[in-house]
């Protein structure tokens, strides 16, 4: 009765072969499937087997795999046959080592989080670097600070707001000497003196396909900065949007497929269909990014009956500009993001 995410021992009965050293056949045609699909453990995808025949529970990290019993694609697993030379028949599910990133000459591994400087925290995700600002740029309430300005303070990474009061004598912005906002690590739980702050969403971690966008917010019981995340998809990877640019034009700012679609995530399907807009592309150096967007909650239903919801970026409009002419300047987007207030909702 013990559960394991996928079978740890596989009872393969390959068809008899003349040459026993050759590769066994794990697929049989016509397909022979059990009358009903199996029940998969929580967190394990129900997928179609490698023979394109039957439903099966995807093999997990460290499980044996074959051309029939395939590894969980939603977890970035592949079948490593290197231990079964020369037959290459039975492998072991292994993690796809994602593409690393290079920033300012420094190489970072896929999934690695790092701070290139004191103002940003970044993560390398499959060759793309996504960053969140560590300096909270909240403006102090006008009620007790009508003339704020930001100043650099020696020994502090982040600029701080100071107030110019009527006597033209600068003072820190927060009343009762609670201290001004500094780097996230230095923000204390403010309780009653808490200034609610939510940073803009960071740019999507991928330029096409499913990515992640993050932001920092202290809107919680502890008034402590926490990272929130949402899924984002700026444009599909499998559509060449260049071919859709009209003759004589250099850009297509927004691309919207004609048919509505369901979002899919880890083998689960959104409970309703959507007709999303995507940002387009340009023929020149300009790039297209969202400037009117919001966050929606998408509910997913899985084959095993379970459901969950995720926050997802919903693009309303995009614009194309030269701000990302230098693809290595990953901070350019972050600096300009607060200017578009629609993005941070």
């Amino acid at each position: 009765t013990a559960l394991s995410p996928a079978p740890t021992t596989m009872d393969f009965t390959p068809a008899p072969l003349e040459d026993t050293s050759s590769r066994p056949q794990f697929c049989k045609w016509p397909c022979e499937c059990p009358p009903s699909p199996p029940r998969c453990p929580l967190g394990v995808s129900l997928i179609t087997d490698g023979c394109e025949c039957c439903k099966m529970c995807a093999q997990q990290l460290g499980d044996n795999c074959t051309e029939a019993a395939i590894c969980d694609p939603h977890r970035g697993l592949y079948c490593d046959y290197s231990g079964d030379r020369p037959r290459y028949a039975i492998g072991v599910c292994a993690q796809v080592v994602g593409v690393g990133c290079v920033l300012d000459g420094v190489r970072y591994n896929n999934g690695q989080s790092f701070q290139p400087n004191c103002k940003y925290n970044c993560t390398c995700i499959d060759g793309a670097v996504g960053c969140t600002p560590l300096c909270l740029r909240v403006r102090p309430p006008r009620l007790w600070c009508p003339h704020p300005r930001r100043v650099s303070i020696p020994g502090h990474c982040c600029e701080q707001w100071v107030c110019e009061d009527d006597a033209k004598r600068p003072r820190k912005t927060a009343p009762r000497d609670t201290g001004a906002f500094d780097a996230v690590g230095e923000v204390e739980a403010w309780h009653r003196n808490c200034i609610a702050y939510t940073s803009p969403w960071s740019p999507c971690s991928t330029s096409c396909g499913l990515g992640v966008s993050t932001r920092i917010s202290n809107v919680n019981a502890q008034c402590w900065p926490e990272q929130e995340s949402r899924l984002c998809n700026l444009r599909p990877c499998d559509v060449d949007i260049h071919t859709l640019i009209k003759a004589g034009k250099k850009c297509l700012a927004v691309y919207q497929p004609e048919a509505s679609m369901n979002f899919t995530l880890a083998g689960c399907i959104s409970t309703r269909s959507y007709q999303p807009k995507y940002c387009g592309v340009c023929m020149d150096n300009r790039c297209c990014i969202p400037y009117k967007s919001k966050t929606i909650d998408v509910s997913f239903q899985c084959p095993d009956g379970l459901g969950f919801s995720r926050q997802v970026l919903w693009i309303n409009a995009c614009f194309c500009n030269l701000s990302c002419r230098n693809p290595n300047d990953i901070f350019a987007d972050l600096e300009s993001y607060p200017d578009f207030s629609e993005i941070a909702n």
Partner: antibody, heavy 117, light 112 residues
């Protein structure tokens, strides 16, 4: 043999927090979904929350949603339950239990959480 | 959520006599794989629950064969052919077909 040992229970005031732990041994912890189930004094069993084998999928009972957080550390063979904003009606023995695909096959001995002012 | 309703809630039995506990679910418990995930647990006084039966009628190892489970659809039964003193405790049914898992209120078995 499979063993699940809960710890971290105690007396706490309403509104405060508590973190329960469950140490697992005798099986490959990282391959099993795990549950927390509770039992108020003199009452029946109430399912609280579950986490998948790798923590990627988590579900909560409506009564604890937004207040309790289940997590696991597979490298330490340990399951956790972070309980915030505790209420008097959270008073119960909390059991850690192993999932068996539509069932629960092993239970810990339980740890008592008393929420009282 | 699926509501599990047990009856009776209290069951006084004479040692050596049979006992029967009913469990009814508010919706069908057949999963898409064809299995019915209905479980029975025993909780002796001061102890943790212990699984007796899974998937309606499968007995766990170490469980005496005087315990048996039956039923289908929404109606299920746990039978004890001859009650012994060590069987005293509370018996719970639990469905594991739909999320979240849900338990019955429990049936307290005591010796007359």
């Amino acid at each position: 043999q499979v063993q699940l040992v809960e710890s971290g229970g105690g007396v706490v005031q309403p509104g405060r927090s508590l973190r329960l732990s469950c140490g697992a041994s005798g099986f490959t912890f990282s391959r099993f979904a795990m549950h927390w189930v509770r039992q108020a004094p003199g009452k029946g069993l109430e399912w609280v929350t579950v986490t998948s084998f790798d923590g990627s999928e988590i579900y909560y009972a409506d009564s604890v949603k937004g207040r309790f957080t289940i997590s696991r550390d597979n490298s330490k063979n340990t399951l956790y339950l972070q309980m915030n904003s505790l209420r008097v009606d959270d008073t119960a023995v909390y059991f850690c239990a192993r999932d068996a695909l539509g069932s629960i096959d092993y239970w810990g001995q339980g740890t008592l959480v008393t929420v009282s002012s | 959520d699926v509501v599990m309703t047990q009856s009776p809630l209290s069951l006084p039995v004479t040692i050596g006599q049979p006992a029967s506990i009913s469990c009814r679910s508010s919706q069908g418990l057949v999963y898409s794989d064809g299995n019915t995930y209905l479980n029975w647990f025993q909780q002796r006084p001061g102890q943790s629950p212990r699984r007796l039966i899974y998937k309606v009628s499968n007995r766990d190892s170490g469980v005496p064969d005087r315990f048996s489970g039956s039923g289908s659809g929404t109606d299920f039964t746990l039978k004890i052919s001859r009650v012994e003193a060590e069987d005293v405790g509370v018996y719970y049914c639990m469905q594991g077909t739909h999320w979240p898992y849900t338990f019955g209120q429990g049936t307290k078995l005591e010796i007359k």
